[in-house]
């Protein structure tokens, strides 16, 4: 909707546009209107943009009016929430951004016979984007002055410059999203797609064989399994097999059959043939044993002569019997095949906790260190093994020994260094234990056997320029005299770094201070205050462009200050009656010389060249293949002699043509076989060999025999706003903006208020390549000086 709010009205005399009084008669004496005030109300008409506004015609975007909201003069700026002074024009179409607005102030006659009369009317054509911010407009000419504000706001869920982009947040089957400030859908966590209705599956879930209805899930398609649905399910019952696709059963080595359950190498897997029989695989799960002499049976398990196989182990002798065989065992062995060692450790004969080890037909005692002998019954001499490490002597005792330790050592073997560190080291020093002694390792700044002494770091007089040295732990500090700094007072302080002087004043460094030499108009320690010239010297108005003031800077004792109303491109010329005109520099025009004259108006650039306006000058950016100040010269593309093998060159626009001889082909007569190579067509064009010629198929934005000429299409229609010049750049374009405009398509108004041209707290109003200063009370002039 388009909203307009009346802010104030000033109709000092209570007059109508036609000069009559709202309330009837004038006072014959002072010619002021008498009787009652105007009964003011407003009418609004909103229509399509008109560069030359016409009062008639339909209000195609809507119209409306307020009730009577005041008399001659009123101010409604403070009355927020009062809808009487507001007109709302809803629109059900895309907002076109540009518009023309007619606002009329009317006097209500309050009777049916007399028609209402118009007080004042304002028209405004412009461009406004939807925003919550109000834009204030003023009508400052004619009998009445009034101020109003306008804005365009989009309905809920509508966005964009045209309020025609719809976005309503939702979290249901059809989508899971919020809307950003531009009306774009922003998917909730776990959702994706243009409508945010596609769940993002578990990270790693196979995009081919897995899917999900809920974010984070991973459901496998039929025939697939595993954490990420990337493992196929083999055929049910598949034993020694794998799959690459679902329901396969691809057998591992040595397995066969439909379910890979048939052993093709039964011999290797089971080794069924005994007694040296040779195994042969005869089929899946089948084998045959060929037995050595004296053995038979499917696995060669039957011995035809029982003693042939040497069944009696450990030198036992074999005797064949009716039941097979019988073994007679050698000493220390027992069992049917003499394979069991008789336990000679039962009972245990080892004394003093010795461990008995069974041998064949005997035993051995493993004695504890203090005992020796066949059954550990003898006392061992432990001193023979030299167990004492740091000792004067070793004494053998029964089942033990004694070491007489050297000073500083202890423990059974005198191998433990006695810790002599008992807190003797001071000032957090660490103690290193030595043999029968210790050493203190001092932290920085301390010395002495026990680190009890603080080292004096000031002893070497490190402070310069009369600095006083203060000793601290492991460091010193220099207290510097005035004018010096640095850890050793080695730096002479430069009070001018950084420069404290403002408004271009020169800074002078002193021993302990600085001095600012202020320019004429400034004063104060840092030259930060504007001199109030009128406090000391009265100003004399010479004419509407100049004032004079007393000054000791000039020989005459008078300084003339010129007005800068004509800006940087003009000089002020005084006229009679307090008026002035601006004498513009070459290349500029307009009331305040703020408009750069368009030197391109005469279209001086030829052959498709683009004209860029300068100050009292212009520059031609030539189309490909042209040069010269006016793009009047066709560049000679034959100058580099591009035609090989005797070919004759003919210059074209941004191109050349080679007339080839003796069967040579191609763009430069370089080939015997083909008309095309990678350099034939420019700018990404595709080359086709057509026998005796070549043809280039050009990408968008390019044309010509070798795609060498940029089409103007990227500049048609002109994408550059506000009088900007479009320069073709292949498939793209560049805008050269007029003064006062910037941005890729010259759509942004340059901030002419930067940097702060208005003095003395004046407020700057930015226009299109101009600014205006609204001065604080007590100040005047174009820049409130």
């Amino acid at each position: 909707q388009f909203e307009l709010e009346i802010l104030s009205m000033q109709n000092v005399n209570g007059e109508l546009q036609n000069g009559n009084c709202c309330g009837g008669a004038r006072n014959p004496g002072d010619r002021k209107c008498t009787r009652d005030e105007c009964d003011t109300y407003f009418k609004v008409c909103l229509k399509e943009y008109q560069s030359r506004v016409t009062a008639g015609g339909p209000c195609s975007f809507g119209s409306g009016s307020t009730p009577v909201i005041g008399g001659n003069t009123f101010n409604l700026k403070a009355s927020r929430g009062n809808d009487r002074n507001r007109i709302v024009l809803p629109f059900s179409f895309a907002w076109p951004r540009s518009y023309t607005l007619l606002v009329e102030a009317w006097d209500s006659s309050n009777d049916t016979v007399q028609p209402d009369s118009i007080i004042e009317k304002a028209s405004h054509s412009g461009m406004i984007n939807p925003s919550r911010q109000w834009q204030t407009l003023k009508q400052n000419t004619g009998v009445a002055h009034f101020e109003y504000q306008i804005r365009v706001t989009c309905d809920d869920y509508y966005y964009g410059f045209g309020c025609n982009k719809f976005c309503r947040p939702r979290d249901d089957f059809f989508g899971h999203y919020a809307c950003d400030q531009n009306g774009n859908k922003t998917c909730m966590e776990g959702w994706m797609g243009p409508e945010c209705n596609r769940a993002i599956c578990r990270q790693g879930c196979s995009p081919k064989h897995g899917s999900c209805k809920l974010p984070g899930d991973c459901r496998c398609q039929y025939g697939w399994q595993g954490l990420y649905c990337d493992k196929c399910i083999p055929h049910p019952g598949c034993v020694h097999g794998i799959c690459n696709e679902p329901w396969q059963c691809l057998c591992e080595t040595n397995w066969g059959g439909q379910l890979c359950d048939k052993d093709l190498n039964y011999c290797g897997t089971h080794q069924p043939c005994l007694n040296g029989g040779t195994c042969s695989n005869t089929g899946p799960d089948k084998y045959q044993c060929s037995c050595p002499e004296g053995y038979s049976g499917p696995n060669c398990e039957i011995a035809e002569h029982a003693c042939l196989s040497d069944p009696c182990h450990n030198r036992g002798s074999c005797k064949e019997t009716s039941l097979g065989f019988e073994c007679e065992c050698s000493p220390g062995w027992t069992g049917p095949t003499c394979s069991t060692n008789i336990d000679d450790c039962s009972p245990n004969n080892c004394s003093h906790g010795g461990t008995c080890q069974d041998l064949v037909n005997g035993f051995k005692c493993v004695c504890p260190p203090q005992w020796t002998g066949k059954t550990c019954q003898l006392d061992a001499n432990e001193c023979e093994a030299k167990p004492c490490v740091n000792a004067k002597s070793c004494k053998n005792l029964i089942a033990s020994y004694y070491c007489d330790c050297l000073p500083g050592w202890m423990g059974q073997n005198c191998d433990i260094n006695i810790n002599d560190c008992l807190g003797q080291c001071q000032n957090d020093a660490s103690c290193r234990d030595l043999v029968n002694g210790y050493r203190c390792i001092c932290p920085p700044g301390y010395a002495g056997d026990h680190c009890e002494r603080d080292i004096d770091e000031c002893a070497s007089n490190p402070c310069l320029n009369g600095g006083h040295c203060q000793n601290e732990i492991n460091r010193f500090q220099c207290l510097c005299p005035t004018g010096f700094s640095g850890n050793l007072c080695q730096l002479d302080i430069d009070y001018c770094e950084p420069n404290p002087c403002q408004n271009g004043a020169q800074c002078y460094n002193r021993a302990s201070d600085y001095f600012c030499k202020c320019p004429e108009d400034y004063e104060g320690k840092n030259c930060s205050h504007l001199k109030d010239h009128c406090r000391t010297t009265p100003c004399e108005v010479i004419d509407s462009c100049t004032v004079a003031m007393a000054s000791n800077d000039t020989p005459e004792g008078v300084r003339y200050i010129s007005s800068n109303v004509c800006g940087p491109h003009g000089k002020c010329k005084s006229q009679s009656g307090g008026k002035f005109t601006c004498d513009c520099n070459k290349g500029f025009t307009g009331t305040y010389c703020h408009e750069n004259i368009n030197d391109c108006e005469s279209n001086p650039c030829r052959n498709g060249g683009t004209c860029i306006d300068g100050v009292n000058s212009y520059k031609c950016i030539c189309s490909d293949g042209w040069e010269g100040a006016y793009c009047e010269t066709n560049i000679n593309d034959c100058s580099q002699n591009p035609c090989h093998n005797g070919g004759t060159c003919r210059d074209l626009v941004n191109d050349f043509y080679c007339d080839c001889k003796n069967g040579w082909k191609g763009k430069t007569c370089h080939s015997r076989d083909s008309q095309c190579d990678e350099a034939t067509c420019n700018n990404g064009g595709t080359c086709y060999d057509e026998g005796d010629a070549f043809k280039c198929m050009c990408p968008g934005g390019w044309e010509g025999t070798t795609c060498n000429i940029a089409r103007n299409s990227s500049c048609l229609p002109n994408p550059c706003h506000n009088g900007g010049t479009c320069v073709v750049n292949g498939e793209s374009f560049t805008c050269v903006c007029k003064e006062g405009w910037e941005g890729p398509i010259c759509a942004q108004n340059t901030n002419d208020c930067s940097p702060h041209p208005c003095y003395n707290s004046g407020t700057c109003v930015d226009g299109d390549n101009w600014y205006r200063c609204e001065c604080a009370p007590g100040f005047a002039g174009p820049d409130c000086r």
């Epitope: 966590e189 776990g190 993002i200 599956c201 578990r202 990270q203 790693g204 196979s206 809920l214 974010p215 984070g216 899930d217 991973c218 459901r219 595993g226 954490l227 990420y228 990337d230 493992k231």
Partner: antibody
Framework: QVQLQESGPGLVKPSGTLSLTCTVS?????????WSWVRQPPGQGLEWIGE???????NYNPSLKSRVTISVDKSKNQISLNLTSATAADTAVYYC?????????????WGQGTLVTVSS | DIVMTQTPLSLSVTPGQPASISCKSS???????????LYWYLQKPGQPPQLLIY???NRFSGVPDRFSGSGSGTDFTLKISRVEAEDVGVYYC?????????FGQGTKLEIK
């Protein structure tokens, strides 16, 4: 800030059923996360038991599959673990942990754990 | 099951010195999406494990930059550039490429 808190009896008889509950705060168990149980026998390493998603999709460690059930109570925002035919080998600290389905970090939040002893 | 093998099983390091733990898997942990699903956790005494590194080399939020991970396929390393007292505990690697998820036996880090 998501928080997980395990609770349940600290002592279970052999051949009985071990039952634990994990209460989640700061996140919904119906979010895009998987919720796992992991256990750690005293002085030993970590063993993954199984996981559940939205109360309907479960995966279990094959070594425990025949004895384990993981379920959810959406109204209480809780995950439960049931382990039948408990033996002394099931004595461990049991942790519940969040395992994001979306995002690269796995097992990014854990409960403090609860010790369960299987003994008569 | 994929077997994760860590070396060494214990480590004693002086504060300020570097430390390195190796983890080998019995199968490649490289997924078809190009990511490698190997994770490192630290379990401080009396606490649950906490995530340090995800997908081989990415530090989880709040993890100091002295921790770094590297490796590919089946061989991975966790490095601590300068060990601090608060780094003591048991470090575990874990694979997330296949069921069941499996952890290494753990490496106990102590301060000398």
């Amino acid at each position: 800030q998501v928080q997980l808190q395990e609770s349940g009896p600290g002592l279970v008889k052999p051949s009985g059923t071990l039952s634990l509950t994990c209460t989640v705060s700061g996140d919904s168990i119906s979010s895009s996360n998987w919720w796992s149980w992991v256990r750690q026998p005293p002085g030993q390493g970590l063993e993954w038991i199984g996981e559940i998603f939205h109360g309907e999709n479960t995966n279990y460690n094959p070594s425990l599959k025949s004895r384990v059930t993981i379920s959810v109570d959406k109204s209480k925002n809780q995950i439960s673990l049931n382990l039948t035919s408990a033996t002394a080998a099931d004595t461990a600290v049991y942790y519940c942990a969040r395992n994001p389905g979306i995002g690269a970090a796995k097992f990014d939040s854990w409960g403090q754990g609860t010790l369960v002893t299987v003994s008569s | 099951d994929i077997v994760m093998t860590q070396t060494p099983l214990s480590l004693s390091v002086t504060p300020g010195q570097p430390a390195s733990i190796s983890c080998k898997s019995s199968q490649s942990l490289l997924h078809s999406d190009g990511k490698t699903y190997l994770y490192w956790y630290l379990q401080k005494p009396g606490q649950p494990p906490q995530l340090l590194i995800y997908e081989v080399s990415n530090r989880f939020s709040g993890v100091p930059d002295r921790f770094s991970g590297s490796g590919s396929g089946t061989d991975f390393t966790l490095k601590i550039s300068r060990v601090e007292a608060e780094d003591v505990g048991v470090y575990y690697c874990m694979q997330h490429i296949d069921f069941p998820f499996t952890f290494g036996q753990g490496t106990k880090l102590e301060i000398k």
